[in-house]
């Protein structure tokens, strides 16, 4: 750490006195102090001498000696008072700028330490401080206004009592700036705009900030627009609004519009797209397949996306059959708006019943006309099976009918003993029928197929089973020959009640 001679923290001299301050360090040293006249500086290796032979009140201040090469950054300081009976204050700056809630140092240095007891801070023209102003005083540094407020942006003077009268410093202007958290907040409305050629349109770009010093502009495809600005102040924020009014839009008005605002903290921008069309439009689409298959008893939501301008004048869901003339309940229809020109319409079909299969159509209307989008809903059913014994062309035949959706396939099993269902251990023979005869196959209905098994002689201690299955499930029917005729068993679990 460098050493200053004289080795005292404070030195008090009279105007006109000679002052010599010597600093010695291990390496080269440097002086730092208030900007003031009449000092001469002499450096010699590891020492530096600051001297004046005519000290004035303006030399009052703290002089610090540092050793630039010292990694610890050590320094030594001495405070010099030049006590001028006519000049109790040495003001180092006449303007101080701080942000709100910071401490503001008004750098009026007392030239005579004896005067400290009688100092005070006042405002120019003898006006007292506002009672809200809290300050402290240091003879070395001046007055510090603590946690300065914007309202304390005033002109101040430092006052000292000398021989019973108050002597003022020159004035110091304090500027307390509002803390600006960032670039101005922006809104650009609408977020998207569509108009038919010849219609009117309005685009509003507005910016707000706690400070009045900011700029805002609206640009179209990178061209700045000349629009008169409206200014306002509310909710403790300054607002600047640019309104673009277009009486009759044309295709050249279409494109990208950007609202841009900037202040000392930076820039914010937001954009929107303006589309100009020749005529009204109405487009319906769905992310879903228009052909839907759902298992009976389950639920389904049908969703339609609508893009339209102008807005919809009407819309509804309609059931087009074929089973009944019922219509979807309005409470199951739901509409959500994604944005101004895009909407989603949903029809909820919970716990579907057989009579609810068929065609569902969403219809919408706007000045561009009517549009419709139709869904085809087919219900899936597990197979239902029945077996009868009959004679065809004189031959004994087991006839198995299976109905379900999708189309069931059929397998015959012959097993030993009398049973409701053949298990693997009992199976004697298996026949697959790859091409059962389709008895009925209408849209939205179950498919009914028939499979024939010709049996020359019915074995009485055996069971003949017809099994049908599809992607939903399976069903079976066991046929047990008995001497008095044939006996059939449809297993309980395959009795189906939708």
């Amino acid at each position: 750490i460098p050493v200053i001679e004289p080795s005292v923290p404070e030195l008090v001299v009279k105007p006109g006195a000679t002052v010599t301050l010597r600093c010695v360090g291990n390496g080269s040293v440097e002086w730092d102090g208030p900007p003031s006249p009449h000092w001469t500086l002499y450096s010699d290796g590891s020492s530096s001498i600051l001297s004046t032979n005519n000290a004035t009140f303006q030399n009052t201040g703290t002089y610090r000696c540092t050793e630039p090469g010292d990694p610890l950054g050590g320094s030594a300081a001495i405070h010099l008072y030049v006590k001028d009976p006519a000049r109790p204050w040495n003001v180092l700056a006449q303007e101080v700028v701080v942000f709100e809630d910071q401490d503001a140092l008004l750098p009026c240095l007392l030239t005579d330490p004896v005067l400290e007891a009688g100092v005070s801070l006042v405002r120019v023209r003898g006006r007292p401080l506002m009672r809200h102003t809290n300050y402290s005083f240091s003879p070395w540094h001046g007055f510090t206004i603590h946690r300065a407020k914007f309202i304390q942006s005033q002109d101040y003077q430092c006052s000292a009592l000398m021989g019973g009268r108050k002597v003022m410093s020159i004035s110091i202007r304090l500027k307390v700036q509002k803390v600006i958290p960032g670039p101005p907040a922006l809104t650009l409305v609408p977020a998207e705009l569509v108009r038919i050629r010849g219609e009117a349109a309005q685009i509003v770009c507005s910016a707000s900030s706690v400070d009045v010093n900011f700029d805002v502009f609206l640009q179209h495809n990178n061209t700045k627009l000349a629009i008169p600005q409206q200014s306002d102040f509310h909710n403790n924020r300054y607002q600047k609004v640019l309104t673009l009014n277009l009486d009759q839009v044309d295709f050249q008005h279409a494109g990208n519009y950007s609202c841009v605002a900037s202040n000392v903290q930076g820039k914010h921008s937001t954009s929107m797209f303006f589309r100009v069309v020749e005529s009204a439009y109405l487009n319906l689409s769905s992310e879903q397949n228009l052909i839907q298959e759902v298992t009976v008893g389950e639920g389904l939501n049908l969703k339609v996306m609508v893009e339209a301008y102008p807005g919809l004048q009407g819309f509804n869901w309609t059931y087009l059959g074929p089973f009944s003339d019922h219509q979807p309940e309005p409470k199951l229809a739901n509409a959500t708006t994604k944005d101004t020109y895009r909407h989603t319409f949903t029809l909820s079909l919970p716990r579907l019943k057989p009579s609810e299969a068929g065609r569902y159509s969403f219809l919408a209307r706007n000045p561009g006309g009517w549009r419709a989008l139709t869904f085809e809903l087919t219900l899936r059913y597990p197979p239902e099976v029945s077996v009868i014994w009959t004679f065809i062309n004189g031959s004994g035949t087991l006839l198995c009918a299976a109905s379900g959706y999708p189309q069931p396939n059929v397998t015959w099993l012959q097993c030993s003993g009398h049973t409701d269902r053949c298990d693997e251990a009992q199976v004697l023979q298996v026949w697959d029928d790859p091409y059962p005869e389709v008895l009925s196959q209408e849209p939205f209905h179950k498919v009914t197929v028939q499979s024939l098994l010709t049996v020359e002689t019915l074995e009485h201690n055996q069971t003949y089973e017809c099994r049908a299955h599809n992607s939903v499930g399976s069903g079976s029917w066991a046929f047990i020959p008995i001497s008095a005729g044939a006996h059939t068993h449809p297993p309980d679990e395959f009795l189906f009640t939708p």
Epitope: R123, R131, I151, S153, N236
Partner: antibody, heavy 116, light 112 residues
Amino acid sequence: EVQLQQSGPELVKPGTSVKISCQASGYTFTVYYMNWVKQSHGKSLEWIGDIDPNTGDSTYNQKFRGKATLTVDKSSSTAYMELRSLTSEDSAVYYCARYDGYIDYWGQGTTLTVSS
Amino acid sequence: DVVMTQTPLSLPVSLGDQASISCRSSQSIVHSNRHTYLEWYLQKPGQSLKLLIYGVSNRFSGVPDRFSGSGSGTDFTLKISRVEAEDMGIYYCFQGTHVPLTFGAGTKLELK
């Protein structure tokens, strides 16, 4: 010329609220605190509180906390005082007054009468 | 709260007399920032208040020099050297140092 123009007299029912305005002109509104003072008939003066027009920060006399709310609208250079849950005790003349290290200018006063 | 006690409550005077009003605070009203926020106001019938003196002894602009203020700590005085007819009204002292700010009860200056 500094002027503080207050809203007109008010006759209100007990239990209701009232909002008194004070429009400032002839000076920069945001450079001075605004004070509010109550003068009851035949009584002395009571300081209600003050407000910094820049921030809306207020200091209240504890006696009026919950009774009075001070606000400002910088765009119109207007200070407001809302008084709520009014009783006959609130009948008085209310003044707004500018503060510059001292209260130097006063409004003409707003007479509030609370009566059923 | 700081209580401001004014005496007398009524002061009958003749035109040209000297008038003196006293105001005593229940505690020191020297602010931590070293200012003494003591003001004197005059209220004439049917009017609002007018500032006469601020900071104990400073005359507000436009106030005639026959008005003067003095005092320190807790004792303060307003003097009117030669009373004129237009000086009649109620005089209030006021302390602006401690919250809540408080007024004296007032002194009515009236002609004998």
